[in-house]
């Protein structure tokens, strides 16, 4: 906290400009009017303030708006957003998608921080629903955001948003979420040819039904064991030995190492021993 001191003669700021970077912290506190700062927030980002100076500017805004900043200020926070705590952000009412984009842009390239998570939560609650534009924006910045949504919330995700999703972004999705996402991915990628389609759909297959797995087995996709192990057990159980062999291609040998783990274990128990023997892997049903 900067102690209160009188502004030296001739140093009172009449506008937010680059001369302020040469002010000491106490001079900023004494010489910059908070209301002036609020109306000229858009200038702050163009000026190379030190982070200590940004702390002073934030303090001035906090004093001016103890109940939370208005959206006109929030939209122009820029770097100053990265000085905000989740507690600060919980006081905000963010309704404009432009404001959300502006702040997400500041954090671009970094993991989703607690501040960003709080901002998104405030925004979605303020809007009352996850509309297409909001989801397009959020998945563009954070494709992994999908896995933080409930299956009910995911039901409103437009298939077009699926294109932004990378395989690693689905790592934290559970089967219930993939059940919702898979049909959307299938729709999104439906016009791709076989091999390209499989590359795109692969990470969503944890939500695929039996009939789709049967269809894939006819396309020489050579699914790897890691993908196979993430398939729904109830979707794998009805597959025949021949279908699994076609589905996995050269990776079928990996079944032996996974014979004690679901879904392989349960699938083996459903097969006739004669059929399993055709694989030549020594699998015991």
């Amino acid at each position: 906290e900067v102690e209160k001191t009188a502004c030296p003669s001739g140093k009172k700021a009449r506008e937010i400009d680059e001369s302020l970077i040469f002010y000491k912290k106490w001079e900023l506190e004494a010489c910059v009017d908070a209301a002036l700062l609020a109306t000229q927030m858009d200038r702050v980002n163009a000026i190379p303030f030190t982070y200590e100076q940004l702390d002073v500017l934030k303090h001035k805004l906090d004093e001016l708006y103890p109940q939370g900043y208005p959206e006109s200020v929030i939209q122009h926070l820029g770097y100053l957003f990265l000085k905000m705590s989740p507690e600060d952000i919980r006081k905000w009412n963010v309704t404009s998608l432009e404001t959300l984009k502006a702040l997400l842009e500041v954090n671009k390239g970094h993991e989703m921080s607690p501040q960003v998570a709080t901002l998104i939560d405030r925004f979605v609650k303020g809007r009352g629903q996850l509309d297409k534009d909001t989801l397009d924006t959020l998945t563009a910045f954070y494709p992994g955001y999908l896995c933080s949504l409930s299956p009910e919330e995911l039901s409103s995700v437009p298939p077009s948003s699926i294109w932004a999703v990378r395989p690693q972004d689905l790592d934290t999705c559970d089967p219930r979420q993939l059940d919702v996402l898979y049909p959307k991915a299938r729709l999104a990628f439906q016009n791709m040819n076989g091999s390209e389609y499989f590359v795109k759909i692969q990470s969503f297959l944890g939500g695929a039904p039996t009939e789709d797995l049967k269809a894939l087995s006819q396309q020489n996709v050579s699914m790897d064991l890691a993908t196979f192990m993430k398939l729904r057990t109830d979707a794998v159980l009805p597959l025949t030995v021949a279908e699994v062999q076609k589905l996995l291609g050269p990776h079928v040998e990996g079944l032996k190492a996974e014979e004690r783990h679901r879904p392989v274990r349960d699938w083996i128990l459903r097969q006739r021993q004669d059929d399993l023997d055709t694989l030549g892997l020594g699998l015991q049903g």
Epitope: P48, Y79, L82, K83, N107, G109, E111, S113, P114, V116
Partner: nanobody
Framework: QVQLVESGGGVVQPGRSLRLSCAAS????????MHWFRQAPGKERELVAA????????YYADSVKGRFTISLDNSKNTLYLQMNSLRAEDTAVYYC????????????????WGQGTLVTVSS
């Protein structure tokens, strides 16, 4: 993570020149702001010059305007401070600092500082 190492300090007579360098180990991005600060014995640290990398806009304290020049060589990832017409009052430890949009695990801004290089102006 960015590491900054200053060099080029030393003892120099009034009216002479020195060139300080600040080598950065990481990439200096377009969103970075680079600063030269100085701290004289028993005095508060003060900002001498700054540069906004993306816009290559330069800023100078009144006390050094016309004498000092800040510059950045992106290919070498090095910040410079050319100091001409040095005066006794320029004696200080000079630090370079980098402010980019780099954040810690909690999403808060990080800045990076060098260890400083001593400049003594004396006859």
């Amino acid at each position: 993570q960015v590491q900054l190492v200053e060099s080029g300090g030393g003892v120099v007579q009034p009216g002479r020149s020195l060139r300080l360098s600040c080598a950065a180990s990481g990439t200096i991005s377009d969103t970075s702001r680079m600063h030269w600060f100085r701290q004289a014995p028993g005095k508060e640290r003060e900002l001498v010059a700054a540069i906004s990398v993306g816009t290559t806009t330069y800023y100078y304290a009144d006390s050094v305007k016309g004498r000092f020049t800040i510059s950045l060589d992106n290919s070498k990832n090095t910040l410079y401070l050319q100091m001409n017409s040095l005066r006794a009052e320029d004696t200080a430890v000079y630090y370079c600092a980098a402010y980019g949009v780099d954040v810690d695990v909690n999403g808060y801004l990080l800045d990076y500082w060098g260890q400083g290089t001593l400049v003594t102006v004396s006859s």
